[in-house]
């Protein structure tokens, strides 16, 4: 079935509306914002999640009074256009007709242009480097224990097979997780590394996308692994096209 049958919810995506109106009275869930049906037995695509996030009422989150020194982090958020499969459309435009090309994880890979900008294909992000800094601990984590625990986490929580976790590097307090997935490697039913990385990023920030699943409690041999900061780097199968003036 596509969702939790007993109470008709979507365990892998809380940003959905579910009702028992599927074939044979089965539970069917639709993503907020797009209204697209989602498969609740796997991760929802990042494009649909971003769209849902942008459509969610801004006051739906718990309000916290920020300190006067707080900086705004917009997370590079925008309201994306998704194709019928839930993937990012290669060309994204905002309401003021400014357009740009994105990769398969929705990150801009060209300079911004106008409506005449062409993005011939959706370029695949085949290598993701997740750079984490953990809070101080009594001692360094054992590298092989950390490696095994992170691979297990991606398999158990994000449905990503360990074969796509290319490496786990560790130099206290920095942990780097390398995800690699070429087009040829990705079989039907395989979770996309971009989607897994996005779910992981939201979990690390304490903004879990799962419904009724506890928050991320990552432990290595019983010792909690608490992340202070996260940086994610994306490498595309075709290098991005930015003008030289952007690089100076």
């Amino acid at each position: 079935h596509t969702a939790a049958q007993d109470n008709c919810t979507c365990p892998t995506n809380k940003m959905t509306v579910c009702s028992p109106d599927g074939p044979g009275g089965r539970c069917q869930c639709r993503a907020l914002g797009s209204g697209m049906a989602v498969d609740c037995s796997t991760l929802t695509s990042k494009c649909l999640l971003l769209k849902a996030r942008m459509s969610a009422p801004k006051n739906a989150r718990t309000l916290v009074r920020p300190s006067e020194h707080a900086l705004v982090d917009n997370d590079g958020l925008y309201d994306p256009d998704c194709d019928p499969e839930g993937r990012f459309k290669a060309r994204q435009c905002n309401q003021t007709s400014v357009c740009w090309c994105v990769n398969s994880v929705g990150v801009r890979r060209t300079d911004k242009g106008d409506l005449s900008l062409r993005c011939d294909e959706l370029v695949r992000t085949h290598h993701i480097l997740i750079d984490l800094r953990h809070r101080p601990t009594a001692g360094a984590f054992n590298h092989s224990d950390l490696d095994a625990e992170l691979r297990r986490l991606f398999r158990e929580r994000y449905r990503l097979h360990p074969k796509f976790v290319a490496a786990v590097h560790y130099e206290q307090p920095t942990i780097q997780i390398e995800l690699r997935q070429n087009t040829s490697q990705k079989a039907a039913g395989d979770v996309d590394i971009g989607d897994a990385a996005y779910y992981f990023e939201r979990d690390i920030k304490g903004e879990s996308l799962f419904q009724g699943r506890g928050g991320l409690d990552l432990r290595v041999r019983g010792e909690p692994l608490q992340v202070e900061r996260t940086l994610i780097y994306y490498l595309d199968e075709i290098p991005p096209k930015f003008s030289m003036k952007r690089l100076t």
Epitope: S41, A148, E156, R159, H161, K163
Partner: antibody, heavy 120, light 107 residues
Amino acid sequence: EVKLDESGGGLVKPGGSLKLSCAASGFTFSSYTMSWVRQTPEKRLEWVATINSDGIYTYYPDSVKGRFTISRDNAKNTLYLQMSSLKSEDTAMYYCTRVHYYGYDAMDYWGQGTSVTVSS
Amino acid sequence: EIQMTQSPASLSASVGETVTITCRASENIYSYLAWYQQKQGKSPQLLVYSAKTLAEGVPSRFSGSGSGTHFSLKINSLQPEDFGSYYCQHHYGIPLTFGAGTKLELK
């Protein structure tokens, strides 16, 4: 001591249904991915279904997809396999297995098995 | 679907001998391979996973090797309790598939 006790097997007619159960003990059931594997009368091993630790993700081969459903009740330490539209080729010994914590689909403990015979 | 081909289908050996069973995958499975032992009338038992890692409690006379498409299980100095059937299984994604088995008999 890890124990996996299957039950629910028996003789069933083609097109019929059967629900297998597996009572687990001796380990933290809710922390482990679990699978069902069957062994045909010719002694071939065939993977049937897998469910992750909290029951969100399930996996099946094409041969049983849409006919078999794996589920679990972590409060009862029990794994289930609901089988419907049974065919003669489903005749086998069905084993409940625990997936190795770090072994990614390698099965480190197997139950004693429960026999399923599909015949008219 | 990845096909697993085991050889030989059966072999006879004596206590104290060293035997090797091989398993070939129809495509590259890197090191995602497990080996199981099944004694007559019993359930299978995990011996090796990730091609070469011995499961808990498995005697050191068993060793796994190989990567990519060719793998082997070696049993040094066969003991009476080692006779039975051996199966390989890839764990490189879904669907999981097993080899047809190798029956190891006492000569």
